[in-house]
C-alpha cells in the first residue's frame, strides 16, 4: 500500500552552495512512501517501524531517523566509590578458630570492636563509608578488610578519591604505630603490630563521560564532545546552542553530517545568505509583485 504524506518545504542553501529542501510550513507537496507489511522502508540508520512511527537509535531522530540529535543523554553515576584492601594485625585479641566463622558470636564481637575502632580512626575523612572484614587468620589476629570510600560525582572525583585513599593510609599507619601493647596489656580499644599494616589493592570507580559520549555518538564520535555545566557533563554536537563549542549559523540552520557540523543557509524574500557561518547576506534585486 501507498501512504501519501503532505510535507511543507523551505529553500535552504548549504554553505557549499547547493540548495536543499527541509521541512517547514505552508506549501504542501505530496510525498509517497511504500510500506511493506509492518516494516517501514523510510526508517533509516537502523531505526524500525513500530506500526505508528519510526523508532530511532541514538544518535538519530526525525520521521525517518535521518537527522542527528544535537545532544545525547549521558548519565554519570550519582556517587562514585573506592575500595581499599588492607591488612592489619590486631595484638589485643588472641586468635581462636571460631573467628573464622562469620556467623559465630566471636566473629560478631570482633567485627563490632574492629568497626568501632576503624570508625574512630577514619572519622575525619568525609568520603569514609565503613569497613568490611573479608578474612581473619592466625597471627595474633590478621585482619584482611576493605575500607569503603564514596563521594558525589564531580569531574574531579578521581582526585578526591585518590586524596582520601592517601589519608586512609596515613591514619591507619599512625594508629597501628601508636596503639601498641605494653607488657602484654592494651589500654586502647585495640592494639596492633606496626609491621603488619599493608595496603594490598585500591579499586576506584571508572567513569569517563567522554568515552560514554563517543560510544553513543557512534560514527559521529569525532564531532561530539563533552562540556560541563554546574559540574554535570553534557554530550553535545556543535549544533547544540548555548555551549562554548556551539556553532553560530547566523542566518541558517546547523546540521550534522558525517563530515561534521555545517550550516544550511536560508533564503528569504529579500536576501540570500552564504558563507561557512551563513553570515554573508546578499540583497535580492527588487521586482514588482502583481496582485
Amino acid at each position: 500500500p501507498l501512504a501519501t504524506i503532505p510535507v511543507s518545504t523551505t529553500s535552504l542553501t548549504s554553505s557549499e552552495g547547493s540548495t536543499i529542501s527541509t521541512p517547514s510550513v505552508d506549501i504542501s507537496t505530496p510525498v509517497t512512501t511504500s510500506i511493506v507489511g509492518d516494516q517501514c522502508s523510510r526508517c533509516k540508520n537502523g531505526g524500525f517501524w513500530d506500526g505508528l512511527k519510526c523508532q530511532c537509535l541514538t544518535p538519530y531522530y526525525g520521521e525517518s531517523c535521518e537527522e542527528v540529535v544535537n545532544s545525547i543523554d549521558i548519565a554519570p553515576p550519582e556517587t562514585v566509590s573506592a575500595q581499599m584492601e588492607l591488612t592489619v594485625t590486631v595484638t589485643s585479641v588472641k586468635f581462636t578458630d571460631e573467628l573464622k566463622n562469620h556467623s559465630s558470636q566471636e566473629f560478631r564481637e570482633f567485627n563490632k570492636t574492629f568497626t568501632e575502632q576503624m570508625n574512630i580512626v577514619y572519622s575525619g575523612i568525609p568520603e569514609y563509608v565503613g569497613v568490611n572484614i573479608t578474612n581473619l587468620r592466625l597471627g595474633s589476629v590478621v585482619v584482611e578488610h576493605d575500607v569503603l570510600l564514596r563521594t558525589k560525582y564531580t569531574p574531579e572525583y578521581k582526585t578526591a578519591l585518590d586524596n582520601a585513599t592517601e589519608v586512609v593510609k596515613q591514619k591507619i599507619t599512625k594508629v597501628t604505630t601508636e596503639q601498641i601493647m605494653t607488657n602484654d596489656n592494651c589500654s586502647a580499644l585495640m592494639c596492633f603490630n606496626t609491621t603488619g599494616t599493608q595496603v594490598q589493592n585500591i579499586t576506584v570507580t571508572q567513569y569517563d563521560p567522554v568515552e560514554e559520549c563517543r560510544q553513543k555518538a557512534e560514527e559521529y564520535e569525532d564531532y561530539f564532545l563533552v562540556e560541563y555545566r554546574d559540574q554535570k557533563p553534557y554530550c553535545i554536537s556543535p549544533c547544540e546552542s548555548g555551549f562554548n563549542a556551539s556553532k553560530n549559523c547566523n542566518h541558517g540552520k546547523c546540521q550534522m553530517s558525517q563530515n561534521g557540523a555545517r550550516c544550511l543557509c536560508v533564503t528569504t524574500e529579500t536576501h540570500w545568505y552564504s558563507g561557512e557561518d551563513c553570515n554573508q547576506g546578499t540583497q535580492k534585486s527588487h521586482h514588482h509583485h502583481h496582485h
Epitope: 589485643s92 570492636t113 601493647m181 596489656n185 585495640m190
Partner: nanobody, 123 residues
C-alpha cells in the same frame, strides 16, 4: 548471649575484706575473657582485674597483692576477693565478659556487662 548479675557489694571499714560475685548465664563461661571494672564518682570506668581463658591475667597497680580474680566454671561464676580495702577502693564494681580472648583494659572492648554492685570503704 551472655547475661551477668553482680552481687556481694556492701559497706566495710578500711582494712576489711569483701568478696563480690558475678553469675553468668549462657554457655560461654569456659571461653573468652572475664573481668572486674570499677567506676569511682566523677571518674571513668577502669579495669581492676581481668582474666582470659588462655591464662592471661591483669591487675591494676593499685590493687596488686590485695585483690584476686577467680572463676568457678561449674557454677558459671566470677569472683573478686578484696582484702586490705582502702577508702579509695570505694566505687561501683561491674563485672564484664567477652567471648574473645582479650588483652585489653579498655572497657569499650568488652561487650557484656553486669549491672554493678556498690562497694563503700569508710575510714
Amino acid at each position: 548471649e551472655v547475661q551477668l548479675q553482680a552481687s556481694g557489694g556492701g559497706s566495710v571499714q578500711a582494712g576489711g575484706s569483701l568478696r563480690v560475685s558475678c553469675a553468668a548465664s549462657g554457655d560461654t563461661f569456659s571461653r573468652g575473657s572475664w573481668g572486674w571494672f570499677r567506676q569511682r564518682p566523677g571518674k571513668e570506668r577502669e579495669a581492676v582485674a581481668l582474666i582470659s581463658s588462655d591464662g592471661w591475667t591483669f591487675y591494676a597497680d593499685s590493687v596488686k597483692g590485695r585483690f584476686t580474680i577467680s572463676q568457678d566454671n561449674t557454677k558459671n561464676t566470677l569472683y573478686l576477693q578484696m582484702i586490705s580495702l582502702r577508702p579509695e577502693d570505694t566505687a561501683m564494681y561491674y563485672c564484664a565478659a567477652s567471648v574473645l580472648v582479650l588483652r585489653t583494659l579498655n572497657p569499650k572492648a568488652w561487650h557484656h556487662w553486669g549491672q554493678g554492685t556498690q562497694v563503700t570503704v569508710s575510714s
